[in-house]
């Protein structure tokens, strides 16, 4: 799915407003220099590419976290924002949570979503020079 | 069982603001967008905005920006629509729709109206 | 003025089938698969009849149906019956910031 066209001020609205503070709660306990931030992104749109495919397509040792609460505000946020989004990725996306077994917090989906955060801070500051 | 249940009619002067409140019951509220669209007597539906709220952020219709406020409140799991600097031409049914989980733009459960009327 | 150009009204005799329009342009209708059809009785609230151009919700009989040419979309009803008197609304979704649009309405009359 091509991101370019998405309404960003709504979507980092959603992010400020709510999206951010679930993902501090999935976070709770765990120190902010646990991880280094591996995953980066150069532009809006490209955040937005590895913002959908961290949140929504299963890795090794974090099998989905398509159930969260910040995964599920993130794609009704694509939803409505990026036009074309539903038809394409909410089926696959509702496939993966299908399949899911049981909610486990592994260290591997710790990491995961500490390079979230990263990503979307990185989304929300897309004028800053890429380190 | 599944329903958008508004609040009663409301007669209004020019000028004054009318909050309008639909209450959700038999769905989970709160990934479902829930959009306004309103009647004017003998006329066609107008869209005026939209909000989903587990996100919070609404969308207005231009012709209403500024002058349309939507809310949730995804406790009581009631969404509402306030529209300020009322004119005779807002004299309307206003309904609550729900837009399906995930595809907001299409409206598959409706409330049953709201009829505000702005008179002097 | 609706951004959206349906007819102001259609008719036919009972069993007979009746085509409503709705014509939009690239930004609307031409450019998403988001139409959507909602039948209107007086004094009742809309009711979705189709959606993403030809799909039917459960309980809508498949007498009706939806297609999509560019930019025009329509409605047609088939074996038309008296209970199918309505006022008949499209919609398209029209990107972010205008989201909905919706047409004037067709008022269908069975004779």
């Known amino acids: 799915y091509d991101f370019t066209n998405c309404d960003f001020e709504k979507i980092k609205a959603a992010y400020l407003s709510t999206i951010s503070k679930d993902l501090i709660t999935y976070m709770s306990g765990t120190k902010s220099t646990e991880f280094n931030n591996t995953v980066s992104c150069s532009n809006r749109p490209h955040c937005l590419t590895e913002i959908q495919s961290l949140t929504f397509n299963p890795t090794a040792g974090c099998a989905s976290l398509a159930k969260e609460m910040f995964a599920m505000k993130t794609k009704a946020a694509l939803a409505i924002w990026c036009p074309g989004y539903s038809e394409t990725q909410i089926n696959a996306t509702q496939a993966m949570k299908k399949r899911r077994k049981r909610k486990v917090t592994t260290n591997k989906c710790l990491e995961q979503v500490s390079q979230l955060q990263g990503l979307w801070r990185r989304f929300n500051r897309p004028l800053l020079k890429q380190q | 069982q599944v329903q958008l249940v508004q609040s009663g009619a409301e007669v209004k002067k020019p000028g004054s603001s009318v909050k309008v409140s639909c209450k959700a019951s038999g769905f989970t509220f709160g990934s479902y967008g829930i959009s306004w669209v309103r009647q004017a007597p003998g006329q066609g539906l107008e869209w005026l905005g939209v909000?989903?709220?587990?996100?919070?952020?609404?969308n207005y219709a231009e012709k209403f920006q500024g002058r349309v406020t939507i809310t949730a409140d995804t406790s009581t799991s009631t969404a509402y629509m306030e529209l300020s600097s009322l004119r005779s031409e807002d004299t309307a049914v206003y309904y609550c729709?729900?837009?399906?989980?995930?595809?907001?733009?299409?409206?598959?459960?409706w409330g049953q109206g709201t009829l505000v009327t702005v008179s002097s | 003025q609706s951004a959206l150009t349906q007819p102001p009204s259609a008719s036919g005799s009972p069993g007979q089938s009746v085509t409503i329009s709705c014509t939009g342009s690239n930004s609307d209708i031409g450019g998403y698969n988001r139409v959507s059809w909602y039948q209107q009785h007086p004094g009742k609230a809309p009711k979705l009849m189709i959606y993403e151009i030809s799909k039917r919700p459960s309980g809508v009989p498949d007498r009706f149906s939806g297609s999509k040419s560019g930019n025009t979309a329509s409605l047609t009803v088939s074996g038309l019956q008296a209970e199918d008197e309505a006022d008949y609304y499209c919609s398209s979704y029209a990107g972010t910031d205008t989201f909905v649009l919706f047409g004037g309405g067709t008022k269908l009359t069975v004779l």
């Open positions: 729709a729900r837009g399906a989980e995930y595809f907001y733009w299409y409206f598959d459960l």
């Open positions: 909000i989903i709220p587990l996100l919070g952020v609404p």
